[in-house]
Interface confidence: medium
C-alpha cells in the first residue's frame, strides 16, 4: 500500500516545510485515496473485461451510487459552499458500504482496498471538522447497509465483477468532482 499522506519521502526530506493547512491536508488525502483507487482499478481491469464495457451497459446496473448534480451546489453555477460540503460528506458516508463490499474482492491488492477504506474514514473526519452544519448530514441506516451488503455479495460472479468496476469508477469520479469543488472553498 502507498505511504499515507504526509509520510512520503519528499516530506521526510524537507522537515522545514510549512505544516499543511486544513485545505491542503484534505486535498492530499483525496489524492492519496485516488491513487489507491487507481491501483485497484488496474487489478480489476486486468482480471476482467469490465473496463471496456459500454456506458449504456453500466447504466443498466441498478446500483444507487452517489453522484454530483447541479442541485448539490458543487458546480460553479449555483456554487454553495455549505450545501456542497454536506453533499460531499453525505456521499462519502454512502460510499462506505460499497467500500466494505470491496474488501474481499481483491487478491493482490487486498491491503490497498483496506487503505482506501480507512483513508476515506479519515477524509470524512477532516471534512466534518470543516462543516458548520453537521445536522444536515444524514448518516446511512446500518440495517439498510447490512442488507445491501448481503444482496451485493449474493450476486453471481459476473455481476460482482461489474459491481466492483462500477463502485471504483463512480468513487473515483465522485472524489475528483469533490476535489474540484473543495478547491473553490
Amino acid at each position: 500500500a502507498p505511504v499515507p499522506p504526509g509520510e512520503d519521502s519528499k516530506d521526510v526530506a524537507a522537515p522545514h516545510r510549512q505544516p499543511l493547512t486544513s485545505s491542503e491536508r484534505i486535498d492530499k488525502q483525496i489524492r492519496y485515496i485516488l491513487d489507491g483507487i487507481s491501483a485497484l482499478r488496474k487489478e480489476t481491469c486486468n482480471k476482467s473485461n469490465m473496463c471496456e464495457s459500454s456506458k449504456e451497459a453500466l447504466a443498466e446496473n441498478n446500483l444507487n451510487l452517489p453522484k454530483m448534480a447541479e442541485k448539490d451546489g458543487c458546480f460553479q453555477s449555483g456554487f454553495n459552499e455549505e450545501t456542497c460540503l454536506v453533499k460531499i460528506i453525505t456521499g462519502l458516508l454512502e460510499f462506505e458500504v460499497y467500500l466494505e463490499y470491496l474488501q474481499n474482492r481483491f487478491e493482490s491488492s487486498e491491503e490497498q482496498a483496506r487503505a482506501v477504506q480507512m483513508s476515506t474514514k479519515v477524509l470524512i473526519q477532516f471534512l466534518q471538522k470543516k462543516a458548520k452544519n453537521l445536522d444536515a448530514i444524514t448518516t446511512p441506516d446500518p440495517t439498510t447497509n447490512a442488507s445491501l451488503l448481503t444482496k451485493l455479495q449474493a450476486q453471481n460472479q459476473w455481476l460482482q465483477d461489474m459491481t466492483t468496476h462500477l463502485i471504483l469508477r463512480s468513487f473515483k469520479e465522485f472524489l475528483q468532482s469533490s476535489l474540484r469543488a473543495l478547491r473553490q472553498m
Partner: antibody, heavy 121, light 107 residues
Framework: EVQLVQSGGGLIQPGGSLRLSCAAS????????MIWVRQAPGKGLEWVSD????????YYADSVKGRFTMSRDISKNTVYLQMNSLRAEDTGVYYC??????????????WGRGTLVTVSS | DIVMTQSPSTLSASVGDRVTITCRAS??????LAWYQQKPGRAPKVLIY???TLESGVPSRFSGSGSGTDFTLTISSLQPEDFATYYC?????????FGQGTKLEIK
C-alpha cells in the same frame, strides 16, 4: 494520433455572436477535461472556460461569465464555445485544449492550433 | 483568485547560457504548477508539470523546482530553439491562472 481541430473564428462586430468548434480525435471528450484558453494580440495566455467530463459542469473566467457558454456533443466528439455579446477586448486567438487531470498530474497536454477571433466595427 | 507573478518579463541570453525564470503564486498551490513554451504563431506546449516532472520528449536541459508559492524553471544550456516565451500556470483551482510570460531573446 491525439489531436484537436478548431474552426469557427473570424471577424465579428461588437455585440455579435460567434461559435467556435473543436473536434477531438484519438481520445474521447466524454472522459476528459476540455478547456478554452485565449491570447489577445501580443499578450499572455488567459483561461476562458472548462468543462469537466464527469457531470458536464462548466467553469468560466469572470471576464466571460454570462456571455460565453461551453458545451459538448459527445456523439460528434466535439466541444463548442458559444460567444455572445462580443466586445473588442475579446479579440485574440482562442485555443481549445485537453486538460490532463488524473489527480496527480494536472496540466494542458494537448492544444488545438488556435482560431483567431476579431471583434471590430 | 490566485495571481501568478513571473520574472523577469524579458531575458536576454546567449546560446550555452544557464537561465532561470521564476514564478511566484499569491497563495500556496502545493506542486500544481506547469511550465509552457510558446513560439510566435504557435500553440503553447508543456515542458514541466507538477512543478518538476519533465514532459515526455522534452530535452533534459529543462528542469523545474519549487513548491508552495515559489517556483523556478531552469534551462541548463540554452540552445537556439529555446528562444521563445515561457509561461508558468497554476493548475490548482479555477480560475486556472497563467503568469504574464517571460520572453527569452538572443543577446
Amino acid at each position: 494520433e491525439v489531436q484537436l481541430v478548431q474552426s469557427g473564428g473570424g471577424l465579428i462586430q461588437p455585440g455579435g455572436s460567434l461559435r467556435l468548434s473543436c473536434a477531438a480525435s484519438g481520445f474521447t471528450i466524454s472522459s476528459n477535461y476540455m478547456i478554452w484558453v485565449r491570447q489577445a494580440p501580443g499578450k499572455g495566455l488567459e483561461w476562458v472556460s472548462d468543462l469537466y467530463y464527469y457531470a458536464g459542469d462548466t467553469y468560466y473566467a469572470d471576464s466571460v461569465k454570462g456571455r460565453f457558454t461551453m458545451s459538448r456533443d459527445i456523439s460528434k466528439n466535439t466541444v463548442y464555445l458559444q460567444m455572445n455579446s462580443l466586445r473588442a477586448e475579446d479579440t485574440g486567438v482562442y485555443y481549445c485544449a485537453r486538460w490532463a487531470d488524473d489527480h496527480n498530474n494536472t496540466y494542458i497536454d494537448v492544444w488545438g492550433r488556435g482560431t483567431l477571433v476579431t471583434v471590430s466595427s | 483568485d490566485i495571481v501568478m507573478t513571473q520574472s523577469p518579463s524579458t531575458l536576454s541570453a546567449s546560446v550555452g547560457d544557464r537561465v532561470t525564470i521564476t514564478c511566484r503564486a499569491s497563495q500556496g498551490i502545493s506542486s500544481w504548477l506547469a511550465w509552457y513554451q510558446q513560439k510566435p504563431g504557435r500553440a503553447p506546449k508543456v515542458l514541466i508539470y507538477k512543478a518538476s516532472t519533465l514532459e515526455s520528449g522534452v530535452p533534459s536541459r529543462f528542469s523545474g523546482s519549487g513548491s508552495g508559492t515559489d517556483f523556478t524553471l531552469t534551462i541548463s544550456s540554452l540552445q537556439p530553439e529555446d528562444f521563445a516565451t515561457y509561461y508558468c500556470a497554476a493548475h490548482y483551482a479555477a480560475p486556472w491562472t497563467f503568469g504574464q510570460g517571460t520572453k527569452l531573446e538572443i543577446k
